[in-house]
Amino acid sequence: ASVGLPSVSLDLPRLSIQKDILTIKANTTLQITCRGQRDLDWLWPNNQSGSEQRVEVTECSDGLFCKTLTIPKVIGNDTGAYKCFYRETDLASVIYVYVQDYRSPFIASVSDQHGVVYITENKNKTVVIPCLGSISNLNVSLCARYPEKRFVPDGNRISWDSKKGFTIPSYMISYAGMVFCEAKINDESYQSIMYIVVVVGYRIYDVVLSPSHGIELSVGEKLVLNCTARTELNVGIDFNWEYPSSKHQHKKLVNRDLKTQSGSEMKKFLSTLTIDGVTRSDQGLYTCAASSGLMTKKNSTFVRVHEKPFVAFGSGMESLVEATVGERVRIPAKYLGYPPPEIKWYKNGIPLESNHTIKAGHVLTIMEVSERDTGNYTVILTNPISKEKQSHVVSLVVYVPPQIGEKSLISPVDSYQYGTTQTLTCTVYAIPPPHHIHWYWQLEEECANEPSQAVSVTNPYPCEEWRSVEDFQGGNKIEVNKNQFALIEGKNKTVSTLVIQAANVSALYKCEAVNKVGRGERVISFHVTRGPEITLQPDMQPTEQESVSLWCTADRSTFENLTWYKLGPQPLPIHVGELPTPVCKNLDTLWKLNATMFSNSTNDILIMELKNASLQDQGDYVCLAQDRKTKKRHCVVRQLTVLERVAPTITGNLENQTTSIGESIEVSCTASGNPPPQIMWFKDNETLVEDSGIVLKDGNRNLTIRRVRKEDEGLYTCQACSVLGCAKVEAFFIIEGAQEKTNLE
């Protein structure tokens, strides 16, 4: 057999045995002569080991460029390829010699050291265990252990070839720690050397670059790129980097394995690329490729190199931001710069600090914007290296959808006397101010829900037929006054007034305010009564534990069956902007109360007494009277508020003071509490008595001492007392100077 390509006018070496394969018996002599056209050499099996001492290569006696190879008493291990070649060329002739040695059918190394077979657990891969044979047609099986398994050639994927070894799908022996070949000759077993099975992985799960993106540097800075490959077990990784400036003087590559937790099913490898001082030519794409031999994965990142540090605002930086109350506002600081600038936000010149409502970073975030957030925000970018600063102002305008002030009050369900003139108001606060406030109305009976009707919490009225106030046919005569603008609680508000000339029919009125960001509405129940009137005795707003009487007075000739009710503990919910349920139409929500009837010449008076009123007594009280003729029920509703009892407190402190003789002292002692406390003054723990020089005013709140004398010096106490206790404050008044002798003395 010939090997290599012929070079100019050179024939292949010629062997004395013109065969590809030669089979000889053990213990015989092997002799082959090789002739050629220039200097020749021989290569033979195992010629790297000590066996060449038995091999003799001699020059031929009969000519130039001729060499004879002789091995006396050949053994099985001499099996293999014998090659005669021209020195320094690829031109060669090869013969494969089988030395049939039935005592040693496998070609073994001189020592019995373990061989190694590398396998992957890939189903499609085969592995060759190199147990070569000295006999070509042996019956060979493969033993794997532990547990011990034997594999026999199947004419398909499992086979043995004397020149190659035992071929088997690698997954079949991946469980094993060692394998060896076994041949049976005349019932005798012969074993090859042991081969240690080394499982080699190949799967690369991922390759991650860090930093992964947005890498920016300026000339002269150090670039450090980490490339981490995560692989299955038993994998070795080769890293390969591609980068713009391959001729870099200061480039350094360090590869290392990373320790993973014991029992982990994964390995990690790290390659670090370092360039000590980058130049503009180092800008570009950096690619890290990790290869396990059977698999390659790569990842790239772009590195930007700036000439010098800089900072500037990006073109998308806003100057005006509009938002509606309650929204989350995000104002990003859009910049171009390297290194990333320090970002500081200011509002109206005051630095902003992050807290739970505001985050001042690359993006200024206001979690729930409110009106007080309106203003000018300045963002200042500072380059951390050059200290160059850039500033930009963003105006934040916070819009407020219309809010109607009266809505925050408990919806009044008081009744209005027939024939009276009434004024209904809607006080609207909105930014920008409402571009219109419209009034609508509808009759109460069109909107009343019968007990049988289902009422949803969100819409307790089946009616939606609102009419414009210009169309007051069948209702009360209405006049809408021109909107007024008023500064209320420091805010510019729009007040819209609806005047009902004569309260003739019960109706519902709705004011609706609209601006560019929303709408607000308020529904007013305008219940007109011809009949009963409610008065409170002795006070409009009793304090808890005081007694109060609710008087319901009705004309005896018109009305009968006066009854007191209280709106039940769970009346229909009144949501902001929704209508209170007309109580006369829904007695199910009323609790009947005990009351005492009195009469005078014209009226019946039903008195409901609350002794020791408590906070639980607060609520809506209904007086119901029935028309003697028509039997129609008339209701009047009065809201009762019971003030909570509060122990006396004194607001503010009395200050110690030093005064000169003859001057005046004026001090104030403001006390609060319910019931209102009585104020008393003491000097040196004795009750202070008014005289010509000592004046107490405004229910003893203000104390004046005129033309002070030395004896006015002392400890002054203001004490505020009620049935719930006392509160006091003290101050020491020092009087300086000598007492002038008066003529009287």
């Epitope: 020592s111 190694v116 252990r145 532990y146 720690g177 240690i196």
Partner: antibody, heavy 120, light 107 residues
């Protein structure tokens, strides 16, 4: 009598290299592979790999691929273990060892160990 | 890789006591297990191979047993010269791994 004699202790700086030798006597050097085992201070034993002394073919355990190289000088019956790019966690005693026979992988003969200290 | 877990990590016993050290593998070893003794400042010394076969020159008070994943080394009568750290090693599957060691002391 089988003997494995290792080179003396070494102190190295991080990033440097070290080469530990193991000279064998009392048997035919090329008949048995040379195996390497590491023991960090106060820790257990870690198998590093081995070299076939007949073919010069090294085999490395997973954690010892890359920076470690096993080599031979058969003329002096000496095996070498070289470690490059030293790190502080490479501080350990490195042992060479030989099997009792070529059929079981237990270590019947051990060198006395070489302490490699990596410190800046 | 096969994980080898030794227990206890240390023990203290009196001279003459029977001492047993356990070694558990994460996989069946089919008795491909060796035991070593390492005295302070010295190299390890082979005691047992194939789970229960005594190495040449090792006193008969040392014995090994076990199969599957659980193996043990027993010193039938502890002697002062047995103070050492003992390691197990599996050679069923490459890479061959060692247990964490058991330090034996005399009370």
């Amino acid at each position: 009598e089988v003997q494995l004699v290792q080179s003396g202790a070494e102190v190295k700086k991080p990033g440097a290299s070290v080469k530990v030798s193991c000279k064998a006597s009392g048997y035919t050097f090329t008949n048995y592979g040379m195996y390497w085992v590491r023991q960090a201070p106060g820790q257990g034993l870690e198998f590093m790999g081995w070299i076939n002394t007949e073919t010069g073919q090294p085999t490395y355990a997973d954690d010892f691929k890359g920076r470690f190289t096993f080599t031979l000088d058969t003329s002096t019956s000496t095996a070498y273990m070289e470690l490059r790019s030293l790190r502080s966690d490479d501080t350990a005693v490195y042992y060479c060892a030989r099997l009792g026979n070529n059929y079981g992988i237990w270590f019947a003969y051990w060198g006395q160990g070489t302490l490699v200290t990596v410190s800046s | 890789d096969i994980q080898m877990t030794q227990s206890p990590s240390s023990l203290s016993a009196s001279v003459g006591d029977r001492v047993t050290i356990e070694c558990r593998a994460s996989d069946d070893l089919y008795s491909t297990l060796a035991w070593y003794q390492q005295k302070p400042g010295k190299s390890p010394k082979l005691l047992i191979f194939d789970a229960n076969r005594l190495a040449a020159g090792v006193p008969s008070r040392f014995s090994g047993s076990g199969s599957g994943t659980d193996y043990s080394l027993t010193i039938s009568s502890l002697q002062p010269e047995d103070v050492a750290t003992y390691f197990c090693q599996q050679y069923n599957k490459f890479p061959w791994t060692f247990g964490g060691g058991t330090k034996v002391e005399i009370k």
